[in-house]
Amino acid sequence: GQFRVIGPRHPIRALVGDEVELPCRISPGKNATGMEVGWYRPPFSRVVHLYRNGKDQDGDQAPEYRGRTELLKDAIGEGKVTLRIRNVRFSDEGGFTCFFRDHSYQEEAAMELKVEDPFYWVSPG
């Protein structure tokens, strides 16, 4: 069946060194346990995280994300998943694309991450 993929409309903000969560869902909501779900980074489609056949596919990850990501699946039965990225880096700033694939049908949603320096202060005046 067809669905839409929905992600945040506004940029998500994170501090360097912190962790950040990128939510993504399908509409209408349905069980996505059997779907392929993933995040990649345009424009070169580097794989941030991939979930397929009921498990995370660590081998397909881009090296810079290996060991830093986790797919939160507590609501996957409703078609809702969250990508957690640990130890956020400045290089993580920019666009991410979330996708759900059900057999041959795939939809995706773009989102943006803004990374800020916790030690950068602008002195007033």
Epitope: P8, C24, R25
Partner: antibody, heavy 119, light 107 residues
């Protein structure tokens, strides 16, 4: 079972302060953006404020900006609303509501707590 | 801020009637719209999300349609339990505005 339980409402004089709490249970609290929505007696619903799951982003209706502060303690599964410089027009039932990832809607609400601002 | 205008404000109907409530947004909100039902003294209940998707556990007599600026909530055959106030809500921006409500009362 998902539960949201508000507390802290009561009678306060104009210009006074009040702190509302919303205790959450039965779900992964940090995965949900949370909002406060109020309803004046006999009136419609008015969104007041929202906070992201991490607590890093907060949003306010123009009517409360600068007077109200939303916060959360994910270790205690609790949402807060600090209300200062209260006015008669802030009199309402205040509900907390959850919103998955900040990209869904208010699928669970608390039972509400009444705030009355009067001298 | 985006304004949401519901019509009618009050609707008198009988059990079995087909009921339609309209919600208009002051600017396009794509499909970022929900419908809620509220009964006196109770918290609102989510019925429809993303303009047309039925929330889990909600009877199929409720349906939603529309996108952009014009949306409708339809109850195909009004039941005694459906007499309540209905609100639309936009979530296109972080100012989550509600419509003023439509009270469905017994004719």
């Amino acid at each position: 079972e998902v539960q949201l339980l508000e507390s802290g409402g009561g009678l306060v004089q104009p210009g006074g302060s009040l702190r509302l709490s919303c205790a959450a249970s039965g779900f992964t609290f940090s995965s949900y953006a949370m909002s406060w929505v109020r309803q004046a007696p006999g009136k419609g619903l008015e969104w007041v404020s929202a906070i992201s799951g991490s607590g890093g982003s907060t949003y306010y209706a123009d009517s409360v900006k600068g007077r109200f502060t939303i916060s959360r303690d994910n270790s205690k599964n609790t949402l807060y609303l600090q209300m200062n410089s209260l006015r008669a027009e802030d009199t309402a039932v205040y509900y907390c509501a959850r919103d998955w990832g900040g990209i869904y809607y208010f699928d669970y609400w608390g039972q509400g707590t009444l705030v009355t601002v009067s001298s | 801020d985006i304004q949401m205008t519901q019509s009618p404000s009050t609707l008198s109907a009988s059990v079995g009637d087909r009921v339609t409530i309209t919600c208009r947004a002051s600017q396009s909100i794509s499909s970022w719209l929900a419908w809620y039902q509220q009964k006196p003294g109770k918290a609102p209940k989510l019925l429809i999300y993303d303009a047309s998707s039925l929330e889990s556990g909600v009877p199929s007599r409720f349906s939603g349609s529309g996108s952009g600026t014009e949306f409708t909530l339809t109850i195909s055959s009004l039941q005694p339990d459906d007499f309540a106030t209905y609100y639309c809500q936009q979530k296109d921006t972080w100012s989550y505005t509600f419509g003023q409500g439509t009270k469905v009362e017994i004719k």
